[in-house]
C-alpha cells in the first residue's frame, strides 16, 4: 500500500519533485566565492559577464573587463595579474582527466585596452599562472614548463625532456593528480615570484592501461595512460627549482630527498613556501604510514637548496595511514619556522598543533571528541578554521577563530549562531590579512553567501542568497530529512534519513540506502540538496538513507582506521547493521529494501548485495571497483598496503566482487560503467560480468561508450532515468 | 617601442675616469637585467657587466674587474656604468643591452664610443 | 669561462645560397646558445636566442639548431640584405662569451 499524498487542500497546490526538475538542474543553488585581489578588494564575474572589481571600504565597483572583450575570444576564465597590468583570458577548454584540462591563453593589456601580439603564447596550454608579484608567468606546454618575465617577452625554457605519457614537468600525471595533489598543476611560485618550483614525474616504467574510445570513425582510437595499479611500478617524482630573474644562471636546483625516505619507495606530497628562500616539502613512504616534512633554505654561496636533518619533522602513524584522506599542509606563522598543522592527538582525534622545534614538542591547540577540518588562515593575531565541534554533530562544519596573540588563547565560534537553523555547514575564503572573509553556507536550508569583517566578525552584506531558489521552493514537496545516530556494539553510526513529504510512522515505506563509504569520506553532511533521492523520496515516497560507517571520516582514529588493511568488510557489515535498525522502526517494508552507490558506494553496494544476508531485494552498482588490484597503487596502498604473499594479497583476493558471484542469484542487479572510465577502468565491471555470466547468474547491466567515470552530458539523464524504471520495478511502483 | 639610448662617451686619457649612462624607454625597466657589451675597433663583442633588476646583484668581465661599476636609477629608467682606471685597451664601441632572463641580448642601444688615449 | 669557436671565420655566397654557420662550445651549454647579426656601423641584432627560437619580426629564413655543445645558424636562401657578420653567443652561468664572428659576404 502506498502513502497518501494529498492531506489539505494547501498541500494540493503544492508538487512533488519531478525527475525533470532534477535533470534539468531546476532547483541547483548558486554560491559567491569573492576572486580576492588585495585586503579590501575582490573580482567577480556579473551575471551579464562583465569582470568587476570591488572595493568593499570605500563601496565602489568597476568593470575592469568587458563582457565585449571576454567574448570576442570566447573566454570563459580570466586571471589578473598581480600588477594589474594584464589579464589572461582563457578559452577552448578541453577537460582532460579530473583536475586536469588544456586551453588557448590570451593576455590582455590593461593600460592600453588591447590584446599583446608579438611572443603569443603556443596552443593548446597545459597550464598557465601568474606569478605572486608583478606579472610574470609560468606556462606547461607540451610537458615542458616556460617562463615569460612580462607577457610581451619570447618565454624561456626551463625543462626540455618533457614527453607525453613519459616525462611530465609542472603538471602531475593521472595517479598523482587524482591520488595525491588533487591539482591540475606541480609548480609553485616563491611569495615574491623569485623563485619557480616544480615536480619531474617520470612515467617511462609505469605499466600503461590501454581502452577503446569508440568516437565516429570507421575503427576506435586506443587512449593509453601511464597508470599505476596497486603493488605495479610507480612514477619517479623529483622536485626542482629555478630563479626566476636568473634561469640560466645555474639552471634548475634539485631539492635533496630526506635519507630516511629515499631509502625506499616514495612520494612527493606538497610543496609550500614559506618566505622567497625558504620552502617546505612534504614526503611519504610508499607504505603511507610515514612522512616527512622538510624545510629546506637556499645558500646563496652555492646557489643550491639546503634541507637540514634538524628541519625534519616526521609523522607517523601506528594504527593506520598517516593523515586522514592526504597527509595535512603546514600553516607557517610569522616567524617563518614555526607552523600549524592538523595530525591526530594522543587520543586518535584530528586536531590543531603548534610546532616550534619537533613534532614531539608539539603544543595542542584544539582538542576533544571532535576534529579539526581545515586551518584557512593565520594571522598575526588570530587563527581560523572550521570543526564539527559544535552539538557534537559530525556533519556539520563551524568556522572558529582562536586569538593566537593573547595567552590563554580564547576561542570564538564566528559561524555557531548566525543562521542556526540554515547554515549548519560553512566554509571560509578570506582577503589578504584576513581583513574581510566571504561565508558559504551549504545549508541544510537555502545555501546562503555572505561578507564580513574580519576584526569584528560582523557581517556586512549578502553576497548571494538564492531568491530565485527559494522561490521556485515554495510549491514544491520536498522530502524531510533527518540526521540521527545509532548506537552499535560501541560504534556510532551517523545516519541521515530522507522522508517522503507526508511521512507516516505507522505505514511502510520501501527503502533505498545510498552508500559511498570510502575511506575517510563522509555522506552524512548537514547540507542543502535537491538531487535523485530528493525526488524518490518526494515523488516515489521511497525512504532514503545514507549511513557513515566504519573507515569514514572526522569522528575519530578509531572509526577511521577501522578499515585499514581491510577494505570490503566493515564498511558493508555496518550498512547492513543499519538496515537492520532501520527495519525495527517499523515503517520499513523489508521485503523492498534496496541499495546503490557509485565508485566506491559502487563496490559496497555490489558486497552488500552479495552478503547473502536476503536483507536487499535489488541494488546498483555504477561504475564500481571489484577488486583492489585493479585500482590505483597511491589509493589503494594507502588503506590496503602491497598485493604481495608477504604483505596483504590474502585480502586483496579474499576482498573482490568476483568472489561473491555466487551469492548475487537471489538478487536484483543492475551493473553500470562508462568504458572510457580512465579512473575506476571498465575492467573492474567486465570482470564482474564475467565472473555473474560464469556462475550463470543472471544480471542487468548498462554501459555508456566513451564516457568516463562521472557519466555526465546526456549519459546523465538516461542514467537516472534506467536506475529510476530500475528501482520502481524493484518496488513494484507504477510508471 | 623599446629603446636604449647611450650617452656620456668619449676621449679620456689612460687612468682616467669616464660614466656612460643609458636611457631605456617602451619597456618596464625595474623588470630586467640590463648590461654592458663592447666592441673594439674592427674586433668581435665582448660582454662587460650586466646588473639584476633591483640592482642588487652584478657581474663582471674579468677584464674590467675592479675597474668598472654598473648601477642603475629605476625610478629613472636609467642604466649607468662608471668606468674608472682606464686603459688603451678598454677603446670600444660601449653597447647598453638588454639580457633577457640573463641569456640573450634582445634590445641593443646604438653604441657611444669611448676612446682611451694620451 | 666557457670558449666559443665559430666556424668559418668568413665565407662567400651568391644571393639565394643556403649558408650554414657552426659555433661550438668548450663545455656543454645545454640550449643557451644565441645568434646575432651586425652590419657595419650598427649595433648587433638578435635572431636565433635558445638555439632554435626565432626571435620576433625574423624573417623565417634563418633557424637554428643543436643543443649542448654544437651549434648551426643556418640561412636558407641568403638575400641581399643578409650580408652580414654574425655572431653566437652562450648564455651560461650568467657569463655570457661571444664567438669571434663570421664574416658572410658576397661571392
Known amino acids: 500500500l502506498r502513502p497518501s499524498r494529498v492531506h489539505n487542500s494547501e498541500e494540493n497546490t503544492m508538487r512533488a519533485l519531478t525527475l525533470k526538475d532534477i535533470l534539468n538542474g531546476t532547483f541547483s543553488y548558486k554560491t559567491f566565492f569573492p576572486n580576492w585581489i588585495s585586503g579590501q578588494e575582490y573580482l567577480h564575474q556579473s551575471a551579464d559577464n562583465n569582470i568587476v572589481l570591488y572595493n568593499i571600504e570605500t563601496g565602489q565597483s568597476y568593470t575592469i573587463l568587458s563582457n565585449r572583450t571576454m567574448k570576442s575570444v570566447n573566454a570563459s576564465n580570466y586571471g589578473l595579474s598581480p600588477d594589474r597590468q594584464f589579464v589572461y583570458l582563457e578559452s577552448d577548454y578541453s577537460k582532460l582527466w579530473r583536475y586536469s584540462y588544456t586551453a588557448t591563453y590570451y593576455i590582455y593589456d590593461l593600460s592600453n585596452g588591447e590584446f599583446v601580439r608579438g611572443n603569443e603564447l603556443p596552443r593548446p596550454i597545459q597550464y598557465l599562472c601568474w606569478s605572486p608579484v608583478g606579472s610574470k608567468l609560468a606556462y606547461v606546454y607540451q610537458n615542458n614548463i616556460y617562463l615569460k618575465q612580462r607577457p610581451g617577452d619570447p618565454p624561456f625554457q626551463i625543462t626540455f625532456n618533457g614527453r607525453e605519457n613519459k616525462i611530465f614537468n609542472g603538471i602531475p600525471d593521472w595517479v598523482y593528480e587524482e591520488e595525491m595533489l588533487a591539482t591540475k598543476y606541480a609548480l609553485w611560485w616563491s611569495p615574491n615570484g623569485k623563485f619557480l618550483a616544480y615536480a619531474e614525474f617520470n612515467d617511462t616504467d609505469i605499466p600503461v592501461i590501454a581502452y577503446s574510445y569508440y568516437g565516429d570513425e570507421q575503427y576506435p582510437r586506443t587512449i593509453n595512460i601511464p597508470y599505476p595499479k596497486a603493488g605495479a611500478k610507480n612514477p619517479v617524482v623529483r622536485i626542482f627549482i629555478i630563479d626566476t630573474t636568473y634561469p640560466a644562471y645555474v639552471g634548475p636546483q634539485e631539492v635533496p630527498v630526506p635519507a630516511m625516505i629515499a631509502s625506499s619507495d616514495y612520494y612527493f606530497s606538497w610543496l609550500t613556501w614559506v618566505t622567497d628562500e625558504r620552502v617546505c616539502l612534504q614526503w611519504l613512504k610508499r607504505v603511507q604510514n610515514v612522512s616527512v616534512l622538510s624545510i629546506c633554505d637556499f645558500r646563496e654561496d652555492w646557489q643550491t637548496w639546503d634541507c637540514p636533518k634538524t628541519q625534519e619533522h616526521i609523522e607517523e602513524s601506528r594504527t593506520g595511514w598517516a593523515g586522514g584522506f592526504f597527509v595535512s599542509t603546514p600553516v607557517f606563522s610569522y616567524d617563518a619556522i614555526s607552523y600549524y598543522k592538523i595530525f591526530s592527538d594522543k587520543d586518535g582525534y584530528k586536531h590543531i598543533h603548534y610546532i616550534k622545534d619537533t613534532v614531539e614538542n608539539a603544543i595542542q591547540i584544539t582538542s576533544g571528541k571532535w576534529e579539526a577540518i581545515n586551518i584557512f588562515r593565520v594571522t598575526q593575531d588570530s587563527l581560523f578554521y572550521s570543526s564539527n565541534e559544535f552539538e557534537e554533530y559530525p556533519g556539520r562544519r563551524n568556522i572558529y577563530r582562536i586569538s593566537i596573540g593573547s595567552y590563554p588563547p580564547s576561542k570564538k565560534c564566528v559561524t555557531c549562531h548566525l543562521r542556526k537553523e540554515r547554515c549548519q555547514y560553512y566554509t571560509a575564503s578570506f582577503s589578504d590579512y584576513a581583513k574581510y572573509y566571504a561565508l558559504v553556507c551549504y545549508g541544510p536550508g537555502i545555501p546562503i553567501s555572505t561578507l564580513h569583517d574580519g576584526r569584528t566578525d560582523q557581517e556586512i552584506k549578502i553576497l548571494e542568497e538564492n531568491k530565485e531558489l527559494e522561490n521556485a521552493l515554495k510549491n514544491i514537496q520536498l522530502p524531510k530529512e533527518e540526521i540521527k545516530k545509532l548506537e552499535v556494539d560501541e560504534i556510532t553510526l551517523w545516519y541521515k534519513m530522507i522522508l517522503p513529504p507526508q511521512f507516516d510512522r505507522s505505514k511502510k515505506y520501501p527503502l533505498l540506502i545510498q552508500v559511498y563509504g570510502g575511506p575517510c569520506s563522509q555522506s552524512v553532511r548537514s547540507v542543502f540538496a535537491v538531487n535523485w533521492i530528493s525526488y524518490l523520496a518526494s515523488k516515489e515516497g521511497m525512504v532514503i538513507a545514507l549511513v557513515d560507517g566504519r573507515g569514514t571520516a572526522f569522528q575519530g582514529d578509531k572509526l577511521l582506521y577501522a578499515v585499514y588493511r581491510k577494505l570490503g568488510v566493515y564498511e558493508v557489515e555496518d550498512q547492513i547493521t543499519a538496515v537492520r535498525k532501520f527495519i525495527e522502526m517499523g515503517f520499513i517494508d523489508e521485503k523492498r529494501i534496496a541499495i546503490w552507490g557509485w565508485s566506491y558506494g559502487g563496490y559496497v553496494s555490489s558486497l552488500a548485495l552479495a552478503s547473502g544476508t536476503g536483507l536487499f531485494k535489488c541494488g546498483i552498482a555504477v561504475a564500481p571497483v571489484s577488486s583492489w588490484e585493479y585500482y590505483a597503487s597511491v589509493y589503494t596502498e594507502r588503506f590496503m598496503g602491497l598485493p604481495t604473499k608477504d604483505d596483504n594479497l590474502e585480502h586483496y583476493k579474499n576482498s573482490t566482487v568476483m568472489a561473491r558471484a555466487e551469492y548475487f542469484r537471489n538478487v536484483d542487479y543492475l551493473l553500470i560503467h562508462g568504458t572510457a572510465d580512465d579512473n575506476v577502468h571498465f575492467q573492474n565491471s567486465a570482470q564482474i560480468a564475467k565472473a555473474l555470466v560464469n556462475a550463470q547468474v543472471d544480471f542487468q547491466a548498462m554501459w555508456y561508450s566513451d564516457q568516463n567515470h562521472g557519466l555526465s552530458g546526456l549519459s546523465t539523464n538516461h542514467l537516472y532515468t534506467h536506475m529510476t524504471h530500475f528501482l520502481k520495478q524493484c518496488f513494484s511502483l507504477s510508471d | 617601442e623599446v629603446q636604449l639610448v647611450e650617452s656620456g662617451g668619449g676621449l679620456v686619457q689612460p687612468g682616467g675616469s669616464l660614466r656612460l649612462s643609458c636611457a631605456a624607454s617602451g619597456f618596464t625597466f625595474r623588470g630586467y637585467i640590463m648590461s654592458w657589451v663592447r666592441q673594439a675597433p674592427g674586433k668581435g663583442l665582448e660582454w662587460v657587466s650586466w646588473?639584476?633588476?633591483?640592482?642588487?646583484?652584478?657581474g663582471y668581465a674579468d677584464s674590467v674587474k675592479g675597474r668598472f661599476t654598473i648601477s642603475r636609477d629605476n625610478s629613472k629608467n636609467t642604466l649607468y656604468l662608471q668606468m674608472n682606471s682606464l686603459r688603451a685597451e678598454d677603446t670600444a664601441v660601449y653597447y647598453c643591452?638588454?639580457?633577457?632572463?640573463?641569456?640573450?641580448?634582445?634590445?641593443w642601444g646604438q653604441g657611444t664610443l669611448v676612446t682611451v688615449s694620451s | 669561462d666557457i670558449q666559443m669557436t665559430q666556424s668559418p671565420s668568413s665565407l662567400s655566397a651568391s644571393v639565394g645560397d643556403r649558408v650554414t654557420i657552426t659555433c661550438r662550445a668548450s663545455q656543454s651549454i645545454s640550449s643557451y646558445l644565441n645568434w646575432y647579426q651586425q652590419k657595419p656601423g650598427k649595433a648587433p641584432k638578435l635572431l636565433i636566442y635558445?638555439?632554435?627560437s626565432l626571435q620576433s619580426g625574423v624573417p623565417s629564413r634563418f633557424s637554428g639548431s643543436g643543443s649542448g655543445t654544437d651549434f648551426t645558424l643556418t640561412i636558407s636562401s641568403l638575400q641581399p640584405e643578409d650580408f652580414a657578420t654574425y655572431y653566437c653567443?652562450?648564455?651560461?652561468?650568467?657569463?655570457?662569451?661571444f664567438g669571434q664572428g663570421t664574416k658572410v659576404e658576397i661571392k
Open positions: 653567443q652562450q648564455g651560461r652561468l650568467l657569463l655570457p662569451t
Open positions: 643591452a638588454r639580457l633577457q632572463y640573463g641569456t640573450w641580448f634582445d634590445y
Open positions: 635558445a638555439a632554435s
Open positions: 646588473i639584476g633588476p633591483e640592482g642588487s646583484r652584478t
